[in-house]
Interface confidence: low
């Protein structure tokens, strides 16, 4: 049913869904703090622009009785229940900030007539791609997939002279929400990644992964997995690894690699870590002081969601345009706005663009070093370290298939 929006006459409300099931196990209080910090900034920016309006947030909590698993598996209906609650209360804001679980976002998008924008900190799965009124402020699976294909094909760098066309993917079902959807995208037979690779096998058991490390008959030297170094160690331990093996560890929302005193453990020498380039002005902010690096990204996405709304509100008000229109609902894309920690760029489909960083472990210093960066906005790789001190032979990444000569 059509719900009236609290979104006119100088008063603009943001509906924030506070769901029990969330992409990251973050106390809702921290997300509230992030939203409130964002509101303060937005009010200041609007005031500076001479716009004398009120901006508030309404936090909508689910009752937690039915949907209490805490992870995303039971989130499908929770989002719809919250929307029903909003509908019954006739209390919808100009924008919906909320569902982070792919299941709930997909279902809400499907089951509602969305005449308002929806901003998500999460919704990583391919099923949430190309949604006209959905904006995602944490890197979705599609962006990861495009990087991997780009990197696999690259063969003109001093440290990567072979195109790759094969891969193993380790996916055992215990992954965090972000990793689950990243690996799901790589596994999907109809995805861009699968389409571009000649050989891809999913390893689902620890033993399968462990066996591949020294299997002379393996079909690929490259293994993709998702998680942190500790996750890898639990799986790999101190087992011997064939010298041609390259493990790509996807760990996007973790900036521990960049801390000054971090030393890479020995088991990381065959590993390339894919992460996001970290910002640096968050560390002292009131809402992030007690957050782990991953949770900082999650809370930051909520905060940036508020700043994005403020950015769009300012533009529409300055142009004398109505906020409760399809034009506003579809406007949250193809733009750059001033985020909390620097500029944030959204692509044509409302998905955040970022700089991904591929790290390697220097055999000299035992430190993580930047091998290359990748700008998701232009789908381009920028080499950084032209003569890396790799563990691999001749300081070059091996071919993906043992025994295959230069291509």
């Amino acid at each position: 049913s059509q719900v009236s929006q609290n979104c006119h006459n100088g008063s603009y409300e943001i509906s924030v869904l506070m769901m029990g099931n969330s992409a990251f196990a973050e106390p809702l209080k921290n997300l509230e703090d992030a939203v409130n910090e964002g509101l303060e900034i937005v009010r200041g920016r609007l005031q500076n622009a001479g716009l004398n309006v009120t901006v508030n947030a309404t936090f909508m909590y689910s009752d937690g009785l039915i949907h209490n698993s805490g992870d995303c598996r039971s989130s499908t209906c929770e989002g719809l229940d919250l929307l029903r609650k909003i509908s019954n209360a006739q209390r919808m804001g100009c924008v919906l900030i909320g569902p982070s679980c792919t299941y709930s976002t997909f279902q809400m998008y499907l089951d509602t007539e969305l005449s308002y924008p929806m901003i998500s900190a999460g919704s990583f799965g391919l099923s949430c791609d190309y949604k006209e009124t959905l904006t995602r402020l944490m890197s979705p699976a599609r962006k990861l997939m495009y990087f991997l294909v780009n990197f696999w094909k690259t063969n003109d760098l001093p440290f990567k002279t072979y195109s790759w066309s094969t891969s193993y993917v380790y996916k055992n079902g215990t992954e965090t929400e972000d990793c689950f959807w990243y690996l799901n995208a790589l596994e999907a037979s109809v995805s861009y990644f699968s389409h571009e690779l000649g050989f891809k096998v999913v390893l689902r058991q620890d033993k399968e992964f462990q066996d591949i490390l020294m299997d002379h008959n393996r079909k690929s030297n490259v293994i993709i997995m998702c998680g942190g170094p500790e996750f890898l160690y639990k799986l790999k331990g101190d087992r011997a690894v064939a010298e041609d093996i390259v493990i790509i560890l996807v760990d996007l929302f973790n900036d521990q690699y960049f801390e000054d005193n971090v030393t890479a453990p020995d088991y990381m020498k065959n590993v390339l870590v894919l992460t996001l380039s970290p910002g640096n002005s968050l560390l002292n902010s009131s809402f992030s002081r007690n957050l782990s690096p991953t949770k900082r990204d999650f809370a930051l996405a909520y905060l940036n969601g508020i700043l994005l709304f403020g950015h769009m509100l300012k533009i529409f008000l300055e142009n004398g345009e109505n906020i409760t229109t399809p034009k506003f609902a579809h406007a949250f894309r193809n733009l750059t706005f001033e985020g909390y920690d620097g500029p944030v760029t959204l692509d044509d489909w409302g998905d955040v663009d970022s700089t991904m960083v591929l790290l390697y472990t220097s055999v000299d210093t035992k430190k993580y070093k930047v091998l290359l960066t990748y700008d998701t906005h232009v789908n381009k790789t920028y080499p950084v370290d032209m003569s890396p001190t790799f563990t691999w032979k001749n300081s070059k990444l091996p071919n993906d298939i043992t025994g295959r000569g230069p291509q």
């Epitope: 960049f258 380039s277 970290p278 910002g279 640096n280 002005s281 733009l335 750059t336 706005f337 001033e338 985020g339 920690d341 620097g342 500029p343 944030v344 760029t345 700089t355 960083v357 930047v370 960066t373 700008d375 906005h377 232009v378 920028y382 950084v384």
Partner: nanobody, 131 residues
């Protein structure tokens, strides 16, 4: 509070030179991205030249080989040396800065953004190149 103040703009004949300066105050970030962004009448803002805290510089294709960005950390001043100026360089030139990221290549990516959204801006200085 961060403040950026540009100077050095003016009118010049095609082929001539100008040197823009940007005095920065209140800027305490150790990792930053700073540079020059211009806006011609009726057009979007575009990055011209950027420099990161690690010294990495990057230029828009249209000014490569003609413009040079530099900084004097002791004076907290940013410069843009503009040589071989063309009429299409006519624009308002803004000094812009942000605590963007720790690595220079991330700063460089700002040059490829439409309307780069830096956190701090100067008021701008007008450059007019006549043929």
């Amino acid at each position: 509070q961060v403040q950026l103040e540009e100077s050095g703009g003016g009118s010049v004949q095609s082929g001539g030179s100008l040197r823009l300066s940007c005095a920065a105050s209140g800027y305490t970030y150790s990792r930053y991205c700073m540079g020059w962004v211009r806006q011609a009448p009726g057009k979007e803002r575009e990055g011209v030249a950027l420099i990161a805290s690690d010294g990495t510089t990057t230029y828009a294709d249209s000014v490569k080989g003609r413009f040079t960005i530099s900084q004097d950390n002791a004076k907290n001043t940013l410069y843009l040396q503009m040589n071989s100026l063309k009429p299409e360089d006519t624009a308002m030139y803004y000094c812009a800065a942000d605590a963007v990221n720790w690595y220079g290549s991330i700063c460089a990516s700002m040059i490829r953004r439409k309307n780069p959204a830096f956190g701090y801006w100067g008021r701008g200085t007008q450059v007019t190149v006549s043929s």
